[in-house]
């Protein structure tokens, strides 16, 4: 079989508050009931895990309490939001999707969303 296809937007610009959202969509070869989604950041060939969540189809994604990610799922789409981003966090954010249950296991890796983060200019002091 071919690798499971995972689609995500090529580029996203974070808001001035350091929030970026994008959709991760996967072409499920079967009827998965348990799905694991991991967001990876690739920069200069270094890869780090940003966040991960396992969810049952039809239920909400549950990230760890201290995670910078939140998300919702709808069918084979996952809507991801990453917050607390700063300019130094600019990079390629890759969506990794694993169909955990029932067997067989499937893995798909997106080509990544380049997230650009621009730190806001500090407000100038006012004499008024």
């Amino acid at each position: 079989c071919k690798a499971m296809h995972v689609a995500q937007p090529a580029v996203v610009l974070a808001s001035s508050r350091g929030i970026a959202s994008f959709v991760c969509e996967y072409a499920s070869p079967g009827k998965a009931t348990e799905v694991r989604v991991t967001v990876l950041r690739q920069a200069d060939s270094q890869v780090t895990e940003v966040c991960a969540a396992t969810y049952m189809m039809g239920n909400e994604l549950t990230f760890l309490d201290d995670s910078i990610c939140t998300g919702t799922s709808s069918g084979n789409q996952v809507n991801l939001t990453i917050q607390g981003l700063r300019a130094m966090d600019t990079g390629l954010y890759i969506c990794k999707v694993e169909l955990m249950y029932p067997p067989p296991y499937y893995l798909g890796i997106g080509n990544g969303t380049q997230i650009y983060v621009i730190d806001p200019e500090p407000c100038p002091d006012s004499d008024f």
């Epitope: 071919k2 690739q42 060939s45 890869v47 780090t48 296991y105 893995l107 798909g108 890796i109 080509n111």
Partner: nanobody, 126 residues
């Protein structure tokens, strides 16, 4: 269904050699990384060596450079790990892993692996 089947493990004396094989079936893509990883009970799984299907870029752990060589036979869908000058520290269960990546992805990064074989045990002892 993707399947990876390892073979070639066994008991060997220090300084000896072994060749591990990993046969891949149920997967067709122009781009993927295949790696050899090892794990013993006290440690996390670590990458030993890896090769990219297209272009043949390779990667080795510092501890095996100059002793281990990874190669592939695309016609047989098989990847080999030639292990020479084996040391007791090489004792572990060796796993073959596959990462279904594309050209944009960093070569042989452990985060991208998800398909695994059942493992083959290598014991280096006199």
């Amino acid at each position: 269904q993707v399947q990876l089947v390892e073979s070639g493990g066994g008991l060997v004396q220090p300084g000896g050699s072994l060749r591990l094989s990993c046969a891949v079936s149920g997967f067709s893509s122009d781009y993927y990384d295949i790696g050899w990883f090892r794990q013993d009970p006290e440690k996390e799984r670590e990458m030993v060596s890896c090769i990219r299907s297209s272009g043949g870029s390779t990667k080795y752990a510092d501890s095996v450079k100059g002793r281990f060589t990874i190669s592939r036979d695309n016609a047989k869908n098989t990847v080999y790990l030639q292990m020479n000058s084996l040391e007791p520290e090489d004792t572990a269960v060796y796993y073959c892993g596959l990462a279904p990546i594309s050209p944009v992805h960093a070569v042989c990064n452990q985060h991208y692996f998800g398909y695994w074989g059942q493992g083959t045990r290598v014991t280096v002892s006199s």
